[in-house]
């Protein structure tokens, strides 16, 4: 049986300050059951970047239509990038539970921020 893959195709993305950054992530299967979340950084100090069900993330929007059936594209777009947004972003699959349990992470995409051209 094939194991779930979390695919972040770009190792790095470079964006000019003020622009939007697209961070791509797809999964190979709709199961196990459970949500996808995005984080910046790894380990216990990581920062939650996007979780559809909880929290308010005004600068982050999913790339795919949120009402799309059987979606396997969990790419996000972050608007109005600043140098403070630089870092490595991870797309993480969780297994549904109480609480949800981290199952698999993508390899990460490093976001670098260029100075806005004058």
């Amino acid at each position: 049986e094939e194991e779930l893959q979390v695919i972040q195709p770009e190792k790095s993305v470079s964006v000019a300050a003020g622009d939007s950054a697209t961070l791509n992530c797809t999964v190979s299967s709709l199961i196990p059951v459970g949500p996808i979340q995005w984080f910046r950084g790894a380990g216990p100090g990581r920062e939650l970047i996007y979780n559809l069900k909880e929290g308010h993330f005004p600068r982050v929007t999913p790339v795919s239509d949120p009402t799309k059936r059987n979606n396997m594209d969990f790419s996000i777009r972050i608007s109005n990038i600043t140098p403070a947004d630089a870092g490595t972003y991870y797309c993480v699959k969780f297994r549904k539970g109480s609480p949800d349990v981290e199952l698999k992470s993508g390899a990460g995409t490093e976001l670098s921020v260029r100075a806005k051209p004058s």
Epitope: S29, I31, P32, V33, P35, I36, T67, R69, R95
Partner: antibody
Framework: DVQLVESGGGVVRPGESLRLSCAAS????????MSWVRQAPGEGLEWVST??????YYADSVKGRFTISRDNSKNTLYLQMNSLRAEDTAVYYC???????????????WGLGTLVTVSS | EIVLTQSPATLSVSPGERVTLSCRAS??????IAWYQQKPGQAPRLLIY???SRDTGIPARFSGSGSGTDFTLTISSLQSEDFGVYYC??????????FGGGTKVEIK
């Protein structure tokens, strides 16, 4: 076309066991969660169990008595029902889960159901 | 467990009339509501998901609306084939998935 065909229902006595099967076709069975939903005679719908890959979920009313499983090589879903009770009498529907957005499942295809009667 | 309350329990309607069915959740379920139609002796059929998205092949006379705790299924002009029982289901917080008790739509 998606097709779900349940089998294995019948009449059993309280305390006995039964195994339901659901043969699936017309979609990539192995990447979808699957569920069992039941309907007692003249009553509404009650969710019973869901399976993802090896992750399983049960209603409190059947936990410890029912076991959901799947065989992806046979495109088949199962429900092993032990220690059956009169209140388990119902039509059991096999349903294909569909996800929307980033989380959350509903049931986009249903089989015709198989009747399980538990009576002494 | 999230409880879904449907009203009315039964509705007697003439063909051509507009029908409004209600589903109220005991807590916020965002837009994670599906609606099903079940005719006697048949399996349920998905009509609406994500509160307002029509499933493939569902006639445009069926529409869903609402978010949070209050949801509505509307049949703009009832056809004779629309009789049956209509159920709402929440998938915001599970297990368990929960269904409303159903609304029976009878043809006058």
């Amino acid at each position: 076309d998606v097709q779900l065909v349940e089998s294995g229902g019948g009449v059993v006595r309280p305390g006995e066991s039964l195994r339901l099967s659901c043969a699936a076709s017309g979609f990539s069975f192995s990447i979808y969660a699957m569920s069992w939903v039941r309907q007692a005679p003249g009553e509404g719908l009650e969710w019973v169990s869901t399976i993802g890959a090896d992750d399983t979920y049960y209603a409190d009313s059947v936990k410890g008595r029912f076991t959901i499983s799947r065989d992806n090589s046979k495109n088949t879903l199962y429900l092993q029902m032990n220690s059956l009770r009169a209140e388990d009498t119902a039509v059991y529907y096999c349903a294909k889960d569909s996800t929307v957005g980033w989380s959350g499942d509903f049931f986009d295809y249903w089989g015709l159901g198989t009747l399980v009667t538990v009576s002494s | 467990e999230i409880v879904l309350t449907q009203s009315p329990a039964t509705l007697s309607v003439s063909p051509g009339e507009r029908v409004t069915l209600s589903c109220r959740a005991s807590q916020n379920v965002r837009s994670d509501i599906a609606w099903y139609q079940q005719k006697p002796g048949q399996a349920p059929r998905l009509l609406i998901y994500a509160a307002s998205s029509r499933d493939t092949g569902i006639p445009a006379r069926f529409s869903g609306s609402g978010s949070g705790t209050d949801f509505t299924l509307t049949i703009s002009s009832l056809q004779s084939e629309d009789f049956g029982v209509y159920y709402c289901q929440q998938y915001y917080d599970w297990p368990p998935f929960t269904f409303g008790g159903g609304t029976k739509v009878e043809i006058k």
